[in-house]
């Protein structure tokens, strides 16, 4: 069977264009040639097949679609738009498929899509309207509940001349499409910072995974509107200290658990507020395992065992005495 995918123009309307009808409608029991299908399980697996395009003839019963380990490179607008539409498709896994670009409206006409995994793809070009639709002003909210974007940072030589953090943030913000999102995974993306308003359009978030990034500070990001947040994963970053404003925000969230293991905490005078908070809070599981990384004399000391006499700062020399 053909592997040619129908790819409408960027000006796709809100229903699949008539040109989609030129491909014969799939037969009820048909399975794309390189795939394995189970109608009983409503599952299609096209795994490790070096596909360069999304199969055109996906069966309309598909609920779970695995397209992992392929060579897709680009997801065009309406990559999954079909006649009849894939109305049942709820879980779509595209991880590890060499995707470099996801175009605006790539996931349009998937009314039941609740779970999307784009992890382990070098996404140098993620359209701001990848999840919002190609015409964000006319498309409604995305049905997505879980979005996995782990390890999508491209190698340095493939990065566009713009902030990767900003590109991802724009896709999460666009058109307020993801306001129903409950689970967002962004682990392993070498994020240096979180854009100030990246979470503003995600009020339904319950689970946010930022593990294994390079976050140094949370100073500019606000968690205040994430009143449903249940777990915030910040393990394996470059966090030095959490400041009072952040601590107060986290404490005010009624359900949250914050995971802070394996960060290089700097145990100097700026750490006093965080230590005091840790001693009182229920928010941080495993808090007894948090240890200082700096200064050298404090290395491997448990944060919970510190008191104010341990947390000093070297006096700053007056400018006239500073040397370069």
């Amino acid at each position: 069977s053909s592997l040619t995918s129908w790819a409408p123009s960027a000006a796709a309307s809100t229903s699949p264009p008539a040109s989609a009808a030129s491909a014969p409608p799939p037969l009820p029991g048909q399975c794309p040639q390189p795939c394995e299908c189970s109608e009983a399980a409503r599952t299609v697996k096209c795994v490790n097949r070096n596909l360069t395009e999304v199969p055109a003839d996906l069966p309309p019963y598909v609920r779970n679609l695995f397209l992992t380990g392929n060579q897709l490179a680009v997801l065009p607008p309406g990559a999954f738009a079909r006649r009849p539409p894939l109305a049942e498709l709820a879980a779509l896994n595209l991880s590890g498929s060499s995707l470099r670009e996801v175009c605006a409206g790539a996931f349009e006409h998937l009314p039941s899509l609740r779970q999307l995994d784009l992890s382990h793809n070098p996404l140098g070009n993620l359209s701001a309207f990848a999840f919002a639709g190609s015409d964000a002003s006319r498309s409604g909210p995305s049905p997505l509940v879980e979005l996995m974007l782990n390890h999508i940072v491209p190698p340095d030589d493939r990065r566009q001349n713009r902030s990767f953090e900003g590109m991802v943030a724009a896709a999460l913000r666009a058109g307020r499409a993801l306001r129903g999102l409950q689970c967002l995974e962004l682990a392993g993306n070498r994020f240096l910072y979180l854009p100030r308003d990246v979470l503003a359009q995600l009020p339904g978030l319950r689970h946010l995974d930022l593990r294994n990034n390079s976050l140094v500070s949370l100073t500019y990001v606000s968690f205040r509107n994430l009143t449903h947040l249940e777990s915030l994963h910040l393990e394996d970053n470059a966090l030095k200290v959490l400041h009072n404003a952040t601590l107060a925000e986290l404490q005010s969230l009624p359900h949250v658990r914050v995971f802070l293991d394996n960060n290089p905490w700097v145990c100097d005078c700026h750490m006093a507020d965080m230590v005091a908070w840790l001693k009182e809070t229920e928010v941080v599981p495993g808090k007894a395992g948090l240890t200082c990384a700096f200064p050298e004399k404090m290395r491997n000391r448990a944060l919970l065992e510190l008191n104010s006499s341990h947390l000093d700062c070297d006096p700053i020399l007056p400018p006239s005495l500073q040397t370069s």
């Epitope: 689970c183 319950r206 689970h207 009624p254 359900h255 949250v256 229920e282």
Partner: antibody, heavy 125, light 107 residues
């Protein structure tokens, strides 16, 4: 101290309904997922249902899906299990348990670290 | 669903002896495994979480090890109060599942 106190068990006919309650104290209830686990007479433990700290996410065992509903009222520090269309095979001691995580998506698992005393549900005609 | 198989079903030992209980998963559960102790007429009690971490208040004679599919609970020297049924439980995949239990009885 941290404790869970259960109520609401009893004898019910097949097809009947029952509501179990579990009152929590001594910890911040809304920050913990909660589970129901049951144990049929002379048998092992069987997980029934779980709910996240906010109450926004739930999971049910296939054996009770569509018949049992887990819920919580964080303002009352209380967990519930609404059981409908009861069958003989639902006869068991039902335990509520505090989970050592908050989100049902979570990676860290701290086990079910606090358990209620158990309440007996008998389904028989 | 993931099936946990515990062995042996029954372990007959004397106080002071070492008890080694096994739990095998039908597929990897990483380290998302807990061990519980249950005595007749009582609720289960958490002993070990994340495969090897002792829960609060659990004596040092209890230890857990393993990762992936094979796990072990060791009681280094049995005390009279340790004779009970022990269950392993995974929370790697939904639904969470329990092993069928190992009964440690007095020889």
């Amino acid at each position: 101290q941290v404790q869970l106190v259960q109520s609401g068990g009893g004898l019910v006919q097949p097809g009947g309904s029952l509501r179990l309650s579990c009152a929590a104290s001594g910890f911040t209830f809304s920050r913990n997922a909660m589970s129901w686990v049951r144990q049929a007479p002379g048998k092992g433990l069987e997980w029934v249902s779980a709910i996240s700290g906010s109450g926004g996410s739930t999971h049910d065992a296939d054996s009770v899906k569509g018949r049992f509903t887990i819920s919580r009222d964080n303002s009352k520090n209380t967990l519930y299990l609404e059981m409908n269309s009861l069958r003989a095979e639902d006869t068991a001691v039902y335990y509520c348990a505090k989970d050592g995580y908050s989100s049902l998506w979570d990676y860290h698992y701290y086990g079910m670290d606090v358990w209620g005393q158990g309440t007996t549900v008998t389904v028989s005609s | 669903e993931i099936v946990l198989t515990q062995s042996p079903a029954t372990l007959s030992l004397s106080p002071g002896e070492r008890a080694t209980l096994s739990c095998r998963a039908s597929q990897s559960v990483s380290s998302y495994l807990a061990w519980y102790q249950q005595k007749p007429g009582q609720a289960p009690r958490l002993l070990i979480y994340d495969a090897s971490n002792r829960a609060t208040g659990i004596p040092a004679r209890f230890s857990g090890s393993g990762s992936g599919t094979d796990f072990t609970l060791t009681i280094s020297s049995l005390e009279p109060e340790d004779f009970a049924v022990y269950y392993c439980q995974q929370r790697s995949n939904w639904p969470p599942t329990f092993g069928q239990g190992t009964k440690v009885e007095i020889k």
